[in-house]
């Protein structure tokens, strides 16, 4: 017998062909011999089956000897053997209806798990293979699970259900809710204004939730909240802001914070946490602030950086247009009795300058000038 696979919610057309290319009497029945539909002349007649309101045929094809059974809005329980009786012949078609659904919601937080559940008729033994938007293949039986969803898992998942050498394809759109970047680092000279931005990697019509920037300053023994806020339909309202530092926050997305000035006591690491309405769990983005200060005290020219720097970063002091006088993988460097001129303090990574601060050293009878 012929096997046809269908998708829950879809429409299927089961074919039945007579040898005579004309309209003759036909009947479609289920395995319990209950009539589904047939014809009486040019009229469609329906039987007492549970498919009554969802079953149909194509009258326009009857004259060509084609008597299809169309079942709309397929249900798993429609899986059955359907019999077409025409010209004293019986054509049997086995219909197997499958459904594939995501665990709860198709909008999931980064790091959460995606579970795809296959609904299948009793007695079937399908196999499922899904391909993620980034090309990762996962296989399974009735359930498939992907733990620790990543941003690249956003998009259309294509799942193929295989049964009796026939296949049916499902497409499920998954949105991974996340920040565009997991981590960012800002390099600033002391006194400069600092801008922190937290762009989201998804767009939804209404975005409501709440959040907090929790900060661990390098110099502080404990971490603390710098700002808390609410988000209503993409509008940001500040709930509470610490008095030192007094951060400012943009009223619109993307989430944007301004620190009036970079100071050594603020250098450190922060974690912006965002809780979204109707979601358990939170989105996180790490942000780091590195602050540089160049000073001259009496006969000592010093350059210091505070904040989370990697051990491979190089801190140098050099007189403009000259070779570096001192260059170390440390957070402070100094030159004793610096000669007069414009000195540069450079923080660099493999030759790329990340941060630069200039300080003018005057002849010994004068005081230094910060440009």
């Amino acid at each position: 017998k012929k096997v046809v696979l269908g998708k829950k919610g879809d429409t299927v057309e089961l074919t039945c062909t007579a040898s005579q290319k004309k309209s003759i009497q036909f009947h479609w029945k289920n395995s319990n011999q209950i009539k589904i539909l047939g014809n009486q002349g040019s009229f469609l007649t329906k039987g007492p089956s549970k498919l009554n309101d969802r079953a149909d045929s194509r009258r326009s094809l009857w004259d060509q000897g084609n008597f299809p059974l169309i079942i709309k809005n397929l249900k798993i329980e429609d899986s059955d053997t359907y019999i077409c009786e025409v010209e004293d012949q019986k054509e049997e078609v086995q219909l197997l209806v499958f459904g594939l659904t995501a665990n709860s919601d198709t909008h999931l937080l980064q790091g959460q798990s995606l579970t795809l559940t296959l609904e299948s008729p009793p007695g079937s033994s399908p196999s499922v293979q899904c391909r993620s938007p980034r090309g990762k293949n996962i296989q399974g039986g009735k359930t498939l699970s992907v733990s620790q969803l990543e941003l690249q898992d956003s998009g259309t998942w294509t799942c193929t259900v295989l049964q009796n050498q026939k296949k049916v394809e499902f497409k499920i759109d998954i949105v991974v809710l996340a920040f565009q970047k997991a981590s960012s680092i800002v390099y600033k000279k002391e006194g400069e204004q600092v801008e922190f931005s937290f762009p989201l990697a998804f767009t939804v019509e209404k975005l409501t939730g709440s959040g907090e920037l929790w900060w661990q300053a390098e110099r502080a023994s404990s971490s603390k909240s710098w700002i808390t806020f609410d988000l209503k339909n993409k509008e940001v309202s500040v709930k509470r802001v610490t008095q030192d530092p007094k951060l400012q926050m943009g009223k619109k997305l993307p989430l944007h914070l301004t620190l009036p000035q970079a100071l050594p006591q603020y250098a450190g690491s922060g974690n912006l946490t965002l809780a979204l309405e109707a979601k358990t769990g939170k989105l996180h983005q790490e942000v780091n602030l590195v602050v540089m200060r160049a000073t001259q005290l009496q006969k000592n020219l010093t350059c210091e950086v505070w904040g989370p720097t990697s051990p491979k970063l190089m801190l140098s002091l050099k007189l403009e247009n000259k070779e570096a006088k001192v260059s170390k993988r440390e957070k402070a460097v100094w030159v004793l009795n610096p000669e007069a001129g414009m000195w540069q303090c450079l923080l660099s990574d493999s030759g790329q300058v990340l941060l630069e601060s200039n300080i003018k050293v005057l002849p010994t009878w004068s005081t230094p000038v910060q440009p």
Epitope: T208, G209, S210, E212, W214, S222, K224, S225, T228, D230, K239, R240, T242, Q243, D244, T273, A275, E277, T280, G281, K282
Partner: antibody, heavy 119, light 107 residues
Framework: EVQLVESGGGLVQPGGSLRLSCAAS????????MSWVRQAPGQGLEWVAN????????YHVDSVKGRLTISRDNAKNSLYLQMNSLRGVDTAVYFC????????????WGQGALVTVSS | DIQMTQSPSSVSASVGDRVSITCRAS??????LAWYQQKPGKAPKLLIY???GLQSGVPSRFSGSGSGTDFTLTISSLQPEDFATYYC?????????FGQGTKVEIK
């Protein structure tokens, strides 16, 4: 180590006054909002008031407004609750707490001071 | 004022049991919810902040979930030291308000 120690509790007659103090140590007191929370005998917790870092912003629950007033002295690392026109319903253990937890949670609490209003 | 309603008001359980306490807010409070544990004669102790964040030093058998108006505190495997009263508290708007408490007793 963060420590909060309440003092000043005791027995007071209805209509009387009392001033509770909370001595803070082990953290930068002037950097945190602080709260008072009370618990009547055998009852649940009731938030009373809170105050911002420099004392310029204060919030009180309606049932105590005009009678109980929160204040602080950052130079002394101390939080206060001035209690006037006391009533029987004010009988409770009063806890001072630091609003230093993430998402505005009360992360450290004192051991409490018992205030009994009775004639 | 936002009303916080906890259920059940008391629960009898045995060591090793899984216990869930629910807290419902009279209006949406996003994730501005904390859970506290209090033992007789002691100050409350913070367990969960922001509806689901585990406070440092708190055992991982405690977990929080929910957002908006419905929240749950779950103790996955009850230990002898967990018999206490548990309170939820909203920090969405003043005045902060607590639930009436749930007493976890030994069966």
């Amino acid at each position: 180590e963060v420590q909060l120690v309440e003092s000043g509790g005791g027995l007071v007659q209805p209509g009387g006054s009392l001033r509770l103090s909370c001595a803070a140590s082990g953290f930068t007191f002037s950097s945190y909002w602080m709260s008072w929370v009370r618990q009547a005998p055998g009852q649940g917790l009731e938030w009373v008031a809170n105050i911002n870092e420099d004392g310029n912003e204060k919030y009180h629950v309606d049932s105590v407004k005009g009678r109980l007033t929160i204040s602080r002295d950052n130079a002394k690392n101390s939080l206060y609750l001035q209690m006037n026109s006391l009533r029987g319903v004010d009988t409770a253990v009063y806890f001072c707490a630091r609003e230093g937890g993430q998402w505005l949670a009360l992360d450290y609490w004192g051991q409490g001071a018992l205030v009994t209003v009775s004639s | 004022d936002i009303q916080m309603t906890q259920s059940p008001s008391s629960v009898s359980a045995s060591v090793g049991d899984r216990v869930s306490i629910t807290c419902r807010a009279s209006q949406g409070i996003s994730s501005w919810l904390a859970w506290y544990q209090q033992k007789p004669g002691k100050a409350p102790k913070l367990l969960i902040y922001g509806a689901s964040g585990l406070q440092s030093g708190v055992p991982s058998r405690f977990s929080g979930s929910g957002s908006g108006t419905d929240f749950t505190l779950t103790i996955s495997s009850l230990q002898p030291e967990d018999f206490a009263t548990y309170y939820c508290q909203q920090a969405n708007s003043f005045p902060w308000t607590f639930g009436q408490g749930t007493k976890v007793e030994i069966k």
